[in-house]
């Protein structure tokens, strides 16, 4: 009984349950392959509990192992379109601090119009994740077609 | 030592570890695009710990943020078959209560025969999740090819 | 306060937070369709906390429900290559003990060059997971393109 009470009294943050799910805000200017994200209940079903957005990029606030997941769907796309505009590639990586820059997850669309994947990776407080979309097809902004999120799993 | 004992005595449900993994039971009648799911140890490796099935649809029993994941493979399918049939799309959404109806996750097969994705989303007690498959190709009932599940992540 | 202290003193292992993320080491000899994995901080961002590697295959150390995820990208691949070398299939399963042998997750590449999926499944201490790649195309060893992992979710 005492444990249950204590558990309820502890702030969730102290349990390390950092989590975020983001929706696409906009693409970058011409020479910037990054996707810019947004999140918050006012926008729909996106949210940030722990991590923060820094100019549309996701910044981690707690060290740990995270499950990172993403889905990106190309707008006005068919397998014909996709193959004619090949190659379109999505890469998720740590883009800052520069000393920790690395690609975590990379997928090409080939003849498809959607990519979706997930992976476990260690992230540190201050790591900023960037999602780079190369190619000439625009990503869909529909919230059920394009989204990006992280979930703290363990220290 | 005392904490470890207390932890073992607490029912898992009180920790909020609701989780379910379902296998395909059958498709709906002519005008019903929903997939009907089943779960339980007698059926193989599917299970429900917390959520319940209501006429083949998954009903949530605990408020929180959930990781929802799905894989659907089309039966007797090749990239040629897939391209020669009406676009096949899968959508996962809250279908009841009607006031909370929304599409959470949507994917098209294009020239592929399998879609797989996952996302984090807030769900509330009583939310029923439906998986709508539009198109004219039958989904595989093999348990390693088609499955649908949710995992409670945090309040 | 007492609970917070106790929580910090408890080893993570006692909370059941077993987790692993692996990178591809090599493919098997001619008649062996298995992929051989490796993990550890010295190799990059792969790691094993709880599970172990047994001759390149992942062995589970704690009973429970796990989230299993995988991404495999074929090397030097285009949709044309993929369709000419079809069928290439990836299956993740329990390969030992033999009494528990079962396919958990299966995907074909069709005209694509990457597959990615995830599922929840019960696993028991001693279960060894194998990932079988059939086909004539080589998997990429890039750590952001090919990876395999498990995450303990609940008892």
């Amino acid at each position: 009984q005492r444990f249950a009470q204590a558990q309820q009294q502890l702030p969730l943050e102290s349990l390390g349950w950092d989590v975020a799910e983001l929706q696409l805000n906009h693409t970058g200017p011409q020479q910037d392959p990054r996707l810019y994200w947004q999140g918050g209940p006012a926008l729909g079903r996106s949210f940030l509990h722990g991590p923060e957005l820094d100019k549309g990029q996701l910044r981690i606030h707690r060290d740990g192992i995270y499950m990172v997941h993403i889905q990106v769907t190309l707008a006005i796309c068919s397998s014909t379109t996709a193959s004619r505009h090949h190659p379109t590639t999505l890469a998720v990586g740590i883009c800052s601090p520069a000393s920790r820059s690395i690609s975590l997850l990379r997928l090409s669309f080939h003849q498809g119009c959607t990519i979706a994947s997930q992976r476990l990776t260690p992230l540190a407080r201050g790591d900023t994740l960037c999602t780079n979309l190369t190619g000439t097809l625009l990503p869909s902004r529909n919230t059920d077609e394009t989204f990006f999120g992280v979930q703290w799993v363990r220290p | 030592q005392r904490f470890a004992q207390a932890q073992q005595q607490l029912p898992l449900e009180s920790l909020g570890w609701d989780v379910a993994e379902l296998q395909l039971n059958h498709t709906g009648p002519q005008q019903d695009p929903r997939l009907y799911w089943q779960g339980g140890p007698a059926l193989g490796r599917s299970f429900l710990h917390g959520p319940e099935l209501d006429k083949g649809q998954l009903r949530i029993h605990r408020d929180g943020i959930y990781m929802v994941h799905i894989q659907v493979t089309l039966a007797i399918c090749s990239s040629t078959t897939a391209s020669r049939h009406h676009p096949t799309t899968l959508a996962v959404g809250i279908c009841s209560p009607a006031s909370r109806s929304i599409s959470l996750l949507r994917l098209s097969f294009h020239q592929g025969c399998t879609i797989a994705s996952q996302r984090l989303t807030p769900l509330a007690r009583g939310d029923t999740l439906c998986t709508n498959l539009t198109g004219t190709l039958l989904p595989s009932r093999n348990t390693d090819e088609t499955f649908f599940g949710v995992q409670w992540v945090r309040p | 306060q007492r609970f917070a202290q106790a929580q910090q003193q408890l080893p993570l292992e006692s909370l059941g937070w077993d987790v692993a993320e692996l990178q591809l080491n090599h493919t098997g000899p001619q008649q062996d369709p298995r992929l051989y994995w490796q993990g550890g901080p010295a190799l990059g961002r792969s790691f094993l906390h709880g599970p172990e590697l047994d001759k390149g295959q992942l062995r589970i150390h704690r009973d429970g429900i796990y989230m299993v995820h995988i991404q495999v990208t074929l090397a030097i691949c285009s949709s044309t290559t993929a369709s000419r070398h079809h069928p290439t299939t990836l299956a993740v399963g329990i390969c030992s003990p033999a009494s528990r042998s079962i396919s958990l997750l299966r995907l074909s590449f069709h005209q694509g060059c990457t597959i990615a999926s995830q599922r929840l499944t019960p696993l028991a201490r001693g279960d060894t997971l194998c990932t079988n790649l059939t086909g004539t195309l080589l998997p990429s060893r890039n750590t952001d393109e090919t990876f395999f992992g498990v995450q303990w979710v609940r008892p």
């Epitope: - | 039966a75 020669r84 039958l138 | -």
Partner: antibody, heavy 119, light 111 residues
């Protein structure tokens, strides 16, 4: 209500071609593949091929591959089956058919078109 | 091509009695959790009518005296209590792969 209405009976000479039409109504024409099945007098059923009206992409039974062409006109929701180099054994009732939800079995059939090949 | 063999070629059954028609495929038509076998009824001068799909699913509007069973290569259509309006030729068809093929048909008559 789904309906498939076929063109009328035809009499053709050996070596000629015949083009049978099938007009679909009661559903979204571009959604469902339309199949052609033939039945010689007093004989069984034989699948000839199908067409996906969304793109016009067709698949044919190898037996007829060199002689059959399936096309569609989305503006009139009509599909056509043309069989060339006719011979007497092509005398049959030709049916168009489609399905109700998933492809592979045929819930809706046209009334049939009798094609007689005779010199 | 998968060859479908129906038996018997013809069958005479008394009204109210059970009629059983068999269909054997030259190789398995079961995969992905389904058996891709379907049954049709055809009366003279009419197109075939779908009775059973995927081995054991009754098509909407079809009387429940019709049932299907089987898996792999061997399948059965059963009419539990034959009625006068059931006099017809019955065909099996597979859709496991292209080309789809039909059985040769079984003629059901009243004894």
């Amino acid at each position: 209500e789904v309906q498939m209405v076929q063109s009328g009976a035809e009499v053709k000479k050996p070596g000629a071609s015949v083009k049978v039409s099938c007009k679909a109504s009661g559903y979204t024409f571009t959604t469902y593949n339309i199949h052609w099945v033939r039945q010689a007098p007093g004989q069984g059923l034989e699948w000839m091929g199908d067409i996906y009206p969304g793109t016009g992409d067709a698949s044919y039974n190898q037996k007829f591959r060199d002689r059959v062409t399936m096309t569609r006109d989305t503006s009139t929701s009509t599909v056509y089956m043309e069989l060339s180099s006719l011979r007497s054994e092509d005398t049959a009732v030709y049916y168009c058919a489609t399905f109700s939800r998933f492809d592979g079995w045929f819930a809706y059939w046209g009334q049939g078109t009798l094609v007689t090949v005779s010199s | 091509d998968i060859v479908m063999t129906q038996s018997p070629d013809s069958l005479a059954v008394s009204l109210g009695e059970r009629a059983t028609i068999n269909c054997r495929a030259s190789r398995s038509v079961s995969t992905s959790g389904y058996s891709y076998m379907h049954w049709y009824q055809q009366k003279p001068g009419q197109p075939p009518k779908l009775l059973i799909y995927l081995a054991d699913n009754l098509e909407s509007g079809v009387p429940d005296r019709f049932s299907g069973s089987g898996s792999g290569t061997d399948f059965t259509l059963t009419i539990s209590s034959l009625q006068a309006e059931d006099v017809a030729v019955y065909y099996c068809q597979h859709s496991r792969e292209l080309p789809y093929t039909f059985g040769g048909g079984t003629k059901v008559e009243i004894k």
